[in-house]
Amino acid sequence: GSGIFQLRLQEFVNQRGMLANGQSCEPGCRTFFRICLKHFQATFSEGPCTFGNVSTPVLGTNSFVVRDKNSGSGRNPLQLPFNFTWPGTFSLNIQAWHTPGDDLRPETSPGNSLISQIIIQGSLAVGKIWRTDEQNDTLTRLSYSYRVICSDNYYGESCSRLCKKRDDHFGHYECQPDGSLSCLPGWTGKYCDQPICLSGCHEQNGYCSKPDECICRPGWQGRLCNECIPHNGCRHGTCSIPWQCACDEGWGGLFCDQDLNYCTHHSPCKNGSTCSNSGPKGYTCTCLPGYTGEHCELGLSKCASNPCRNGGSCKDQENSYHCLCPPGYYGQHCEHSTLTCADSPCFNGGSCRERNQGSSYACECPPNFTGSNCEKKVDRCTSNPCANGGQCQNRGPSRTCRCRPGFTGTHCELHISDCARSPCAHGGTCHDLENGPVCTCPAGFSGRRCEVRITHDACASGPCFNGATCYTGLSPNNFVCNCPYGFVGSRCEFPVGLPPSFPWVA
């Protein structure tokens, strides 16, 4: 503890100028005071002034009023500092002396004589209020007041509580009148060293190092650190815990970058054709009559469907076509004949059969020939049977479709996955991605196709925690940890939903 006992001398009266021994001072009593402060004694005794002592210079002659003086000699009030817990009780002895010598240092002069003394014993609480008193004896009267106050930075009823305002990383506070800490705005805790984070900052996922701040722990983002960060590279997906990639509707794959609904997202089929999804990024367009091409983007000639029969030749017109019929035929499509079997109208060995009592006929064609008069060699490619841009080829009595890369099936209707070719070596896992297949390599291998054997296996040291699976060849660090449910972080080292005091790496 630390405090000051203050004594204010106000007035001293010694009208007759007498000493305690009955003698008078000549020419008058040049008066100074000695003060002794000590622990409480029921009967005041001589001995050390345990709480301190002080002397004044000469303050006046015989009777005088003592003025307040804050510095230099003759300071009033008198100061008696102490460096202990104030006990609340005291004994005080005030002696008035006459000196024939030095005004400023009468204590050192020989021949000093006692004028009078008073003794006060009692209790005194720490406080700013002055206690005023007056003591008389037969010859003299002394008016005075006194109090005990705490030294700077000391507080409490016994001046025992030390408190110094501070504003650094060991505390941000001021001191209350009782010495308790009053935290500065934005700070809390026993020592006012804990910042109050931005209002709403997530308790587990955010923290702060100064007030009104919200710093996100790994795996979280947003102003209040309440939004999880999805897996790096997640394209069309979201997360409910960090590093997840839950795919939006119509998307698939590890990174939700494989389009499972290409038809809806991209509408690739033109001219009213029908689009059918067929796996990641795969689709087939079924064209309306008069259109062809992978996306039905190519309009066919109006004559492409060979509408003219019986050897009629077709001529394209602006919005239609016109059939030029050979002799013996007429009608929009040359479908009506003026010939009979007598005219031998069936070519290529076709057999003629009379109809309608010989007014018309019908040809029965040998294999590989068709047409009303068996005039056409059968072309099995006429119906455009090959999908996805496949080329149709006649092979005698049959036809085959020559498919573009990436398609298969009798009519090239099936989309081949890039992964079907098993491009990943050494047991790597294949993923169909937009720009071709990507391989996830097992431990010990890397490269685009897992063809490179790693001499130093990044997974060998077991860098993944909490039962996570380690993969190499996916990242610059040479390994990636696939976390089990409930764990996050580049090494799956952080459990989800930690208590606020969980230690995080800065």
Epitope: L162, R166, D167, D168, H169, F170, G189, Y191, Y207, P503
Partner: antibody, heavy 121, light 104 residues
């Protein structure tokens, strides 16, 4: 009882970076009651405070060294580290790590045994 | 920058009282710690917050701080107290050590 142990190379070439690690045992570095500091003492001279850090990574540096100093913490390993770049012979000193206590008003109540780092080519 | 000044050395006879001063501008408004360092050893905290003793530190070590001066007092000094003593205070966010006093 908490113990602190400095580790790192004892010899560093001029213009290079001095790197030291302090491992804390017998107690968690992740307490809000402490800051973890670095103090150095050139041979035959007095103590100089370098800087400190708490468990969430808030750092404070001596202004005279601030441009060259980085202090970091790894709570998973219960360690904190010092990096001092562009060293000269004047950086030759015994480097101490210490625990500065908030309840003790910032007094450093635990110290490592110190490690001498000499800067010389 | 803030500076703390200590006398280079203080001599004392065994059993007597040694007083080590540490001065700095308005130092009384800051908390002062004192450290003892013996040759070849790490410093040891002997006083914190001006006058508080950590557990295990003998009662003969005491401290005070007012005005511009903090004082470490070793009463009844013993030969084992021979060491270097450093005062330390915090100026804003920076730790500042005194120049050190050798007690013999």
């Amino acid at each position: 009882e908490v113990q602190l142990q400095e580790s790192g190379p004892g010899l560093v070439k001029p213009s290079e970076t001095l790197s030291l690690t302090c491992t804390v045992s017998g107690g968690s570095i992740s307490s809000s009651s402490y800051y973890w500091g670095w103090i150095r003492q050139p041979p035959g001279k007095g103590l100089e405070w370098i800087g400190d850090i708490n468990y969430i990574g808030s750092t404070y540096y001596n202004p005279s060294l601030k441009s060259r100093v980085t202090i970091s913490v790894d709570t998973s390993k219960n360690q904190f580290s010092l990096k001092l770049s562009s060293v000269t012979a004047a950086d030759t000193a015994v480097y101490y790590c210490a625990r500065e206590s908030v309840p003790l008003g910032g007094g450093a109540d635990e110290w490592g045994q110190g490690t001498l780092v000499t800067v010389s080519s | 920058s803030y500076e703390l000044t200590q006398p280079p050395s203080v001599s004392v006879s065994p059993g007597q009282t040694a007083s080590i001063t540490c001065s700095g501008d308005m130092l009384g408004d800051k908390y002062v710690s004192w450290y003892q360092q013996k040759p070849g050893q790490s410093p040891v905290l002997v006083i914190y917050e001006d006058s508080q003793r950590p557990s295990g530190i003998p009662e003969r070590f005491s401290g005070s701080n007012s005005g511009d001066t903090a004082t470490l007092t070793i009463s009844g000094t013993q030969p084992m107290d021979e060491a270097d003593y450093y005062c330390q205070a915090w100026d804003s966010e920076t730790g500042v050590f005194g120049s050190g006093t050798k007690v013999t």
